[in-house]
């Protein structure tokens, strides 16, 4: 009833609340004297679903059969409708359209740890959009059996709040979850379990990690599990990896020795636990432990390269470089670099520790034969000595590489290919691929970036520390014994027209010919490797088209003599550059008039 | 310290009901397992009923279906119902707390902490 209901009631039969698919007779009726003042008969019944009228009677009840009802609550109100007057409420009732409670599915009970509390979760069916009871219940030794009611509207988990313990770990309990409401009942089929069954152990914590003798191979993990626990499994990987290595292991008593680690890495552990070989689940994962393995000596060799430049008679700079080893063979931090020089013949060596840099030059006697060793150190030892005899690397001109070109290969990539030399090619033992940025200056600051190739390679893809639009030198060398030949070509991985043109600062006459000077474009200007510089040249005032000198690039000119201009004749000279892409835009423009005689 | 009071016993006819409280003073017993025993003269004391922290129930199987145990936190009182007495019911009522967590073992005399007085109940055929 939803109202008062003074003057009338409104009566459901079978029931307030049905089954989907029922028919249900609603009957409205008056209570005596409180129907149309003055006209019983004209007393007009109507009986609304929701706001929707569905049927009237004249009289004083009114009885309607109704079919159909949709799942869930349907509201009914009966109103009596007068002449000259406003619709009265009489009274309403609510039908509840359901369906019984299906079985229960997939009962399942578990007891998180030794300590904790025995809960169940099942799979309700379909809803049955009435208020729906379940009863949880558990029997077990002594003839007992614990009940739990939930009466929450979706309720498919119920904790017992009951502990569960090992002094009989082979006794039978039996969960059973039964649903009830006003359509019918349904039980689960019950769940038979022991107590190593369903407890699932709490994850392991307290872990820890030692290494003895700060090595590595002596590496122990160490664990706090709860008392029952016979199984762990560990699992374990360096922190940039995502492939766990797996280990199992039974009566491990919270410790258990790894041997496979490797130095110097990040590593994450975690563990699980198990109460039995086969009976029961695992627990979670612990939570992650993170410890970083200890160094150990690095292995492996630097790789090692070299540039000599004269500087006079006597004397030559040598420039040392070399690459990081890679963090598997450093197993450590690199605390230096040893370098060693030595003369041969004489037996004169200097030792010289390198940190912060991958590089070392000093100044030697151009005379004497003169080698060199670098090696690695972190704080348990050092990599072996690469051995390195310094050579002349060009000078063995049979050695060149011959038809040496380099090409864009795709965004900052160059692909340098070439043939091997006319000698016997067999004789080279390796290729080494040097690029470094092109600086007119010849600046030996200038990082240098090598890369070595096997004998029988004639094509190297250089693609480390190549931007875009900047000119590269790049020479390849063969080397043989203590021998070497080189071959040098420009390239890029991308260009364009230059920025600019060259700047004229100087214009000078020589003998009835001028002699132009320029200061070279900026290197963040020439969009790539320069193929020529044009020098353009016309009479002051005059609409002709200008005359063209066209140079071929050469790192280090900055001057070019023209002798084809008419003495005392006003011209407007200026210069561009050019690259494979095109021509950059006018430089400054200077005038100039020769002050020589005529022919 | 928990003090356990027992009341509602008294005589009532075979076949009538009789309601009893445990009511607790001195610490809030909402986390503790309440059980009910009772003693009848010249025998041993028996478990009846206990209800836990998370309102789960269990009884024995003599009073299954006649007796319902029930709790009211904000009261700090458990509640034995007892319907359809019979002379073998007779017996002075005890209840009982558990201050640990439930275990299974919730019928033996011995995993409860505080106890009550006890409250007599008879049922006269």
């Known amino acids: 009833k939803i109202d008062a209901c003074k003057r009338g009631d409104v009566t459901v039969k079978p029931s307030h609340v049905i089954l989907l698919g029922s028919t249900v007779n609603i009957t409205c009726s008056l209570k005596p004297r409180q129907g149309c003042f003055h006209y019983s008969r004209r007393n007009k019944l109507i009986l609304y679903k929701f706001d929707r009228r569905i049927n009237f009677h004249h009289g004083h009840s009114l009885n309607s059969q109704v079919t159909g009802l949709p799942l869930g609550t349907t509201l009914f109100v009966c109103k009596l409708a007068c002449i000259n007057s406003d619709e009265i409420q009489i009274c309403g009732a609510e039908i509840f359209v359901g369906v019984a409670p299906e079985q229960p599915q997939n009962l399942s009970c578990i007891q998180k740890g030794e300590q904790g509390t025995v809960a169940c979760t099942w799979e309700r069916g379909r809803d049955t959009h009435l208020y729906t009871e379940y009863t949880l219940q558990l029997s077990g030794p002594k003839n007992l059996t614990w009940q739990k009611q939930c009466k929450d509207i979706y309720c498919d988990y119920l904790d017992f709040g009951i502990n569960l313990t090992p002094e009989s770990p082979e006794s039978n309990f039996t969960a059973k979850v039964t649903a009830v409401n006003s359509l019918g009942s349904s039980s689960s089929l019950p769940s038979t379990f022991t107590f190593l069954d369903i407890v699932r152990p709490l994850p392991p914590w307290d872990i820890r990690i030692k290494f003895q003798k700060a090595s590595v191979s002596r590496c122990t993990l160490y664990w706090r599990d709860e008392g029952l626990v016979l199984l762990n499994r560990l699992r374990y990987r360096p922190s940039n990896s995502r492939l766990w290595n797996m280990v199992n292991v039974t009566k491990a008593k919270g410790r258990h020795d790894l041997l496979d680690l490797k130095p110097f890495t990040e590593y994450e552990f975690q563990i699980s636990s198990k109460l039995h070989l086969y009976k029961g689940s695992w627990s979670d994962w612990s939570e992650s432990l993170r410890a970083q393995t200890p160094e150990e000596e690095p292995t492996g060799m630097l790789d090692v390269w070299y540039m000599k430049r004269h500087i006079d008679y006597s004397r030559q700079q040598i420039s040392l470089f070399w690459k990081n080893l890679s963090v598997s063979e450093a197993r450590g931090k690199i605390l230096h670099y040893q370098v060693t020089l030595q003369e041969l013949t004489g037996g004169k060596a200097m030792t010289q520790n390198i940190t912060g840099h991958t590089s070392w030059t000093t100044v030697i006697p151009r005379t004497g034969n003169w080698a060199v060793a670098v090696s690695a150190a972190n704080s348990k030892g050092s990599s072996l000595p690469t051995r390195i005899n310094i050579m002349n690397l060009c000078e063995a001109g049979l050695l060149a590489p011959r038809q040496v070109s380099a090409n864009s290969e795709g965004m900052d990539n160059i692909l340098v290919t070439w043939q091997p030399p006319r000698k016997d090619p067999s004789a080279v033992q390796e290729y080494v691929v040097e690029w470094r940025e092109l600086h007119p200056g010849g600046d030996t600051q200038v990082p240098l970036n090598w890369l070595r190739s096997r004998p029988y390679n004639v094509s190297a893809l250089i693609s480390e520390n190549i931007k875009s639009y900047i000119c590269y030198e790049i020479r390849v060398y063969a080397l043989s014994g203590d021998q070497g030949g080189c071959s040098s070509i420009l390239g890029n991985s991308k260009h364009k027209a230059p920025l600019s043109g060259p700047h004229i600062n100087a214009i000078t006459e020589e003998k009835g010919s001028i002699l132009i000077s320029w200061n070279s474009i900026p290197v963040q200007e020439q969009m790539g490797c320069l193929l020529h510089y044009r020098i353009y040249w016309k009479e002051r005032d005059s609409n002709s088209q200008p005359q063209l000198c066209e140079i071929p690039y050469r790192v280090s000119q900055n001057s070019h003599p023209i002798n084809s201009l008419q003495p005392r004749v006003t011209y407007v000279l200026w210069m561009t550059a050019l690259t494979a892409a095109g021509e950059s835009s006018h430089g400054n423009e200077r005038e100039f008039c020769l002050q020589g005689k005529a022919n | 310290q928990l003090q356990l009071v027992e009341s509602g016993g008294g005589l009532v006819q075979a076949g009538g009901s009789l309601r009893l409280s445990c009511a607790a003073s001195g610490l809030t017993f909402s986390g503790y397992t309440v059980g009910w025993f009772r003693q009848a003269p010249g025998k041993e004391r028996e478990f009846v009923a206990a209800?836990?922290?998370?309102?789960?129930?269990t009884y024995s199987e003599f009073v299954k279906g006649r007796f319902t145990i029930s709790r009211d936190n904000a009261k700090n009182t458990v509640y034995l119902q007892m319907s359809s007495l019979k002379p073998e019911d007779t017996a002075v009522y005890y209840c009982?707390?558990?201050?640990?967590?439930?275990?299974?073992?919730?019928?033996?005399?011995?995993?409860?902490?505080?106890w009550g007085q006890g409250t007599q109940v008879t049922v006269s055929s």
């Open positions: 009982a707390a558990q201050r640990s967590r439930t275990s299974w073992y919730a019928s033996t005399a011995e995993a409860y902490d505080y």
């Open positions: 209800i836990n922290w998370s309102s789960a129930y």
